[in-house]
């Protein structure tokens, strides 16, 4: 499928609108600090060039790779050295090293101002007067803050963003219509970004085999009626799509994702009975829908797994002859029978089974050695079951905010070297698992809980990688993808940690606290809580609870006072003194 001009090929496949949007996303994810107007200029130049190649594929430079074309364009930015420092050195390299260099400079936590939402009327006016610029600004702002956002999915979000404004800017009460929709889009966007970040981390840190294994588990759970060949085909294509997107090849990624959606819809009968509705939708919605489709019903006639994987006399022969295929089939067969297990658990079971075969197939009596292999799975299964039970009980007892606090204390004691903002952000996200998963029926709880926790812990891993401060975090993040969550769960209080010196400034609050939203107030309180634990790592939960209750009462009291600032100034030191006593 060789094309004389790759850029012309993608322009024709994707159409001008999607082409421009994807190039904008790609550039925004690479050059996260560049102003919007600069990016628009670059995108327009690339688009005009692409059009000349569509007209004549043999025209000058049209035969160049997309990386070469895009990299050359990025390297024309005048302020590259001043804005990005050593990222400018990438421009001295040749492809493919240059693109690898750009990828390594992607920043998961760029130093950008928080997005402030303008008044509804201001947004509606901007939308109605300059719709195209308004939507492109959305793509730009999201992409630069989330440099691994799944690009074709971001186009879907932009479509939903546009629909929200189209509907609500005509409504009687624009705010009541629009704001909940924007909140929902923001939350869904953050979730989508975090999920994709795990996929990219999986590919980049643990390789294609790890990603394929995870995909086999998920696809098999979703399409239990599909045969192994079909699952393998979908997994191979899916791996290509995500490898491309994670590698910055957004045009190829979007094109291949559309191809995969087409394939799935043309082969519904051999994949799943749940695809019909998705396949009736237009492209972006169709792909989104297929990615989130519910699990199909399990076939009724599935035979016992032990037949092929324990009882068969050919287990070692089959394993030896084609290790990856045999293990892929095991994972497929186990996963399609267990929609109630998390993908990570299924991968742990496959790893345990593989280790047992490595051990037993070497011996003179392999069958005698691996006969009880399925019994060895029990503790692996019970671990996430207990995790779900324990944490959902805590969530139901405390509610989300106090459950987040419980997790914040737990994780601050485990890894006190990690920065407080990171601990707060990660613990808040970990705590959301309760709201998201604990209301689910029993059969859906474990996959919801554990796979969500994997996504959140990956956020901790990527943030920590930027500035590593804890060997324990590094160890849990790098040793094994599937065992990250059990690794973090198993961490005890770090006894080697020297308590942080008391800093009065950390515990000094002002009247501006009263004007903060509920969420912002929670973050302030949780920041204080983490700092408190770092100062007194031996404090018990009861002691911390007392201090936090006193703190909440202090904020409430001062926010009701006539002279709020005076109240904070006067009562603050008293609170600090009382806390010191309570924690002594």
């Amino acid at each position: 499928d060789a094309h004389k001009s790759e850029v012309a090929h993608r322009f024709k496949d994707l159409g001008e609108e999607h082409f421009k949007d994807l190039v904008l996303v790609a550039f925004s994810q690479y050059l996260q600090q560049c102003p919007f107007e600069e990016h628009l200029k670059l995108v327009n130049e690339v688009t005009e060039f692409a059009k000349t190649c569509v007209a004549d594929e043999t025209a000058e430079n049209c035969d160049k790779s997309l990386h070469t074309l895009f990299g050359d364009k990025l390297c024309t930015v005048a302020t590259l050295r001043e804005t990005y420092g050593d990222m400018a050195d990438c421009c001295a390299k040749q492809e493919p090293e240059r693109n690898e260099c750009f990828l390594q400079h992607k920043d998961d936590k760029p130093d950008l101002p928080p997005l402030v939402r303008p008044e509804v009327d201001v947004m509606c006016t901007a939308f109605q007067e300059h719709e195209d610029t308004f939507l492109k600004k959305y793509l730009y702002e999201v992409a630069r803050r989330h440099p691994y956002f799944y690009a074709p999915e971001l186009l879907f979000f932009a479509q939903k963003y546009k629909a929200a404004f189209t509907e609500c800017c005509q409504a009687a009460d624009k705010g009541a219509c629009l704001l909940p929709k924007l909140d929902e889009l923001r939350d869904q966007g953050k979730a989508s970004s975090a999920k994709q970040r795990l996929k990219c981390a999986s590919l980049q840190k643990f390789g294609e085999r790890a990603f394929k294994a995870w995909s086999v588990a998920r696809v098999s759970q979703r399409f239990p009626k599909a045969d192994f060949t079909e699952v393998t085909k979908v997994v191979t294509d899916l791996t290509k799509v995500h490898t491309e997107c994670c590698h910055g090849d957004l045009l190829e990624c979007a094109d291949d994702r559309a191809e995969l959606a087409k394939y799935m819809c043309e082969n519904q009968d051999s994949l799943s009975s749940k695809l019909k509705e998705c396949c009736e939708k237009p492209l972006l919605e169709k792909s989104h829908c297929l990615a989130h489709v519910e699990n199909d019903e399990m076939p009724a006639d599935l035979h016992a797994l032990t037949d092929d994987y324990v009882e068969s006399k050919d287990v070692c022969k089959n394993y030896a002859e084609a290790k990856d295929v045999f293990m892929g089939m095991f994972l497929y067969e186990y996963s399609r029978r267990h929609p109630d297990y998390s993908a990570m658990l299924l991968l742990r079971l496959a790893k345990a089974y593989e280790a047992t075969l490595e051990k037993c197939c070497a011996t003179a009596d392999p069958h005698g050695c691996y006969a009880k292999v399925f019994d060895e799975f029990q503790p692996l299964v019970e671990d996430p079951q207990n995790l779900v039970k324990h944490n959902c009980e805590l969530f139901e007892q405390f509610g989300e905010y106090k459950f987040q606090n419980e997790l914040l204390v737990r994780y601050t004691k485990k890894v006190p070297q990690v920065s407080t903002p990171t601990l707060v952000e990660v613990s808040r996200n970990l705590g959301k698992v309760g709201t998201k998963c604990c209301k689910q029926p029993e059969a859906k709880r474990m996959p919801c809980v554990e796979d969500y926790l994997s996504v959140v812990l990956n956020q901790l891993c990527v943030l920590h990688e930027k500035t590593p401060v804890s060997d324990r975090v590094t160890k849990c993040c790098t040793e094994s993808l599937v065992n990250r969550r059990p690794c973090f769960s198993a961490l005890e209080v770090d006894e080697t940690y020297l308590p942080k010196a008391f800093n009065a400034e950390t515990f000094t609050f002002h009247a501006d606290m009263c004007t903060l939203s509920e969420k912002e107030q929670q973050v302030k309180k949780q920041t204080a809580l983490a700092e408190l634990v770092k100062h007194k790592p031996k404090a018990t939960n009861e002691q911390l609870k007392t201090v936090m209750e006193d703190f909440a009462a202090f904020v409430e009291k001062c926010c009701k006072a006539d002279d709020k600032e005076a109240c904070f100034a006067e009562e603050g030191p008293k609170l600090v003194a009382a806390s010191e006593t309570a924690l002594a």
């Epitope: 394993y319 030896a320 047992t356 197939c361 011996t363 040793e479």
Partner: antibody
């Protein structure tokens, strides 16, 4: 580069003890491998001592080695050990550690250079 | 315990000769045998595994055959670098297995 390096050999008196180490690099024990010890007395043939499975620590020994020799592993250090007790003159040999061909044990494709143990008074 | 009896214990031959070494297991071991080459001062090098499969990087003049109890290593056309000692091994990891043959020293005639 994938390799095994033995250490800990030397001169020891009869009845004494010695612990040999086999450090792996280029691959991780956490992926589960068999690591075996083989010895060779000066001018003699190869003699299988035993093996450990890095996954769960399962061990097998040649019948003559049982009781006196113990094989263990420390996955965090990517190292396998051979603890030898009640040493005799006939234990004098070069001790090699080796890894079988992965995917079903077919023979040992990765060997260390060996470490010499001399048992003498 | 399985015993691997290798013969001959020594053998002299010339460059270009076809050489055969045999190994007999004291009990049936399926195709679980391997052959190694060892030169002085070096660790052994795997030549053949699973009775007949050529290990990675080994020249095709080496071949293995046999199953059950009788196994053979053949060098079709001896090269100068092939003069060394050869060992067979039962490749089960088990307390009663893992034994090597006594070795065959191949020298220049």
């Amino acid at each position: 580069e994938v390799q095994l390096v033995e250490s800990g050999g030397g001169l020891v008196q009869p009845g004494g003890s010695l612990r040999l180490s086999c450090a792996a690099s280029g691959f991780s024990f956490s992926s589960s491998y068999w690591i075996c010890w083989v010895r060779q007395a000066p001018g003699k043939g190869l003699e299988w001592v035993g093996c450990v499975f890095t996954g769960d620590g399962t061990t097998y020994y040649a019948s003559w080695a049982k009781g006196r020799f113990t094989i263990s592993r420390d996955n965090s250090k990517n190292t396998v050990y051979l603890q030898m007790n009640s040493l005799r003159a006939e234990d004098t040999a070069t001790y090699f550690c080796a890894r079988p061909v992965s995917v079903y044990y077919y023979g040992m494709d990765l060997w260390g250079q060996g470490t010499l143990v001399t048992v003498s008074s | 315990d399985v015993v691997m009896t290798q013969s001959p214990s020594s053998l002299s031959a010339s460059v270009g000769d076809r050489v055969t070494i045999t190994c007999q297991a004291s009990q049936i071991i399926s195709s679980r045998s391997a052959w190694y080459q060892q030169k002085p001062g070096q660790p052994p090098k795997l030549l053949i595994y699973q009775a007949s499969k050529l290990a990675s990087g080994v020249p095709s003049r080496f071949s293995g055959s046999g199953s059950g109890t009788d196994f053979t290593l053949t060098i079709s056309s001896l090269q100068p670098e092939d003069f060394a000692t050869y060992y067979c091994q039962c490749t089960y990891i088990d307390s009663n297995f893992g034994a090597f043959g006594g070795g065959t020293k191949l020298t220049v005639l």
